[in-house]
């Protein structure tokens, strides 16, 4: 009696169980009563990552540099190419089909945590005594200049966006 189900790594065709092609190979012809399934390796730019009965291999992903992508891991006959973003960029989504610049922290904010491939920059407000006058994805809040150590006095107070302005001591006060 012909089978109605086949073992793992087999498929049912024409009332008989044929072996699936192994990862990295595509189906050329189904098995018969007298012959085994015929499979052929995928070409250099192609892959199949499962036991299969596909007649065509899949094309490796192209990491388009115009979209900010670069190769993280070259594809093999059994795996797809893995793309990642160039320095200073991160993926727009899990599939990483394109990249965008890391979020910049606005003036008055500094970088608490630099972006990763899957999460954007974490910014934090500059606390009292610190400032940031630039929009940056890498710069932390910087401390106000210490006028005293330069034998100067504060002429203008600092803010979260500006450094203090130092000036000479008022000689009259001596």
């Amino acid at each position: 009696e012909p089978p109605t189900a086949c073992r793992e790594k087999q498929y049912l065709i024409n009332s008989q169980c044929c072996s699936l092609c192994q990862p990295g190979q595509k189906l050329v012809s189904d098995c018969t009563e007298f012959t085994e399934t015929e499979c052929l390796p995928c070409s250099e730019s192609e892959f199949l990552d499962t036991w299969n009965r596909e007649t065509r291999c899949h094309q490796h992903k192209y990491c388009d540099p115009n979209l900010g992508l670069q190769v993280q891991q070259k594809g093999t006959s059994e795996t797809d190419t893995i793309c990642t973003c160039e320095e200073g960029l991160h993926c727009t989504s899990e599939s990483c089909e394109s990249c965008v610049p890391h979020r910049s922290c606005l003036p008055g904010f500094g970088v608490k945590q630099i972006a990763t491939g899957v999460s954007d920059t974490i910014c934090e407000p500059c606390p009292v005594g610190f400032f940031s006058n630039v929009s940056s994805a890498f710069e932390k809040c910087r401390p106000w200049t210490s006028c005293e150590t330069k034998d100067l006095v504060v002429q203008q107070a600092g803010t979260n966006k500006t450094d203090v302005v130092c000036g000479p001591q008022d000689r009259q006060r001596a």
Epitope: S93, E94, C105, S119
Partner: antibody, heavy 121, light 107 residues
């Protein structure tokens, strides 16, 4: 579809500890930062803690710093919140929250149903 | 920390009405703002992110606008299922903070 299921809430005395868990499914857990957000009865939302996708960095609200610890087990698709030295003001519904990630980082796109923690003597 | 202030604290409107909720940040947050809806006894749900981007699956009657410090959530034609609390959240800087909420009631 994305599912976040919290457990471990309950009634606890001040000064005691509690551990919350959150089982995640329907997305690649290991690719996303996760958060805990809480809501005291009849009050608004308060962000509590963040853990990065790989657990390499963790951040906390000042109100829980030094008392709460966020952690994750990517092999089990589970997020945790260890809460020590609990106070009455920690009484709230605690939500496990998925970060939207990538260029939408720090927006909260999926929330669990919440688990109630009551700190009372 | 950045303070988020919502107004009004509550609004009562009829089905079909246009409802507007505003959110003000204590510092410039560019467009890093989200809006959430929360129904009684339920978890919040993301409606709008990046000030004006509609989250997948959210009805187009919800829209967001604004940048810098002033933001608006608009429900163009209020539906019975839109009752609940609405919260804004700034995603510009740590720690992430929410507005105090606006209660929307159906007349």
């Amino acid at each position: 579809q994305v599912q976040l299921v919290e457990s471990g809430g309950g009634v606890v005395q001040p000064g005691r500890s509690l551990r919350l868990s959150c089982a995640a499914s329907g997305f690649t857990f290991s690719n996303y930062a996760m958060h805990w957000v809480r809501q005291a009865p009849g009050k608004g939302l308060e962000w509590v803690a963040l853990i990065s996708f790989d657990g390499s960095y963790k951040y906390y609200a000042d109100s829980v710093k030094g008392r709460f610890t966020i952690s994750r087990d990517n092999s089990k698709n589970t997020l945790y919140l260890q809460m020590n030295s609990l106070r009455a003001e920690d009484t709230a519904v605690y939500y496990c929250v998925k970060d939207a990630g990538y260029s939408s980082s720090w927006f909260f796109d999926y929330w669990g149903q919440g688990t109630l923690v009551t700190v009372s003597s | 920390d950045i303070q988020m202030t919502q107004s009004p604290s509550s609004v009562s409107a009829s089905v079909g009405d246009r409802v507007t909720i505003t959110c003000r940040a204590s510092q410039d947050i560019s467009s890093w703002l989200a809006w959430y809806q929360q129904k009684p006894g339920k978890a919040p749900k993301l409606l709008i992110y990046a000030a004006s981007s509609l989250q997948s699956g959210v009805p187009s009657r919800f829209s967001g606008s604004g940048s810098g410090t002033d933001f608006t959530l608009t429900i163009s034609s209020l539906q019975p299922e839109d009752f609940g609390n609405y919260y804004c959240q700034q995603a510009n800087s740590f720690p992430w903070t929410f507005g105090q909420g606006t209660k929307v009631e159906i007349k």
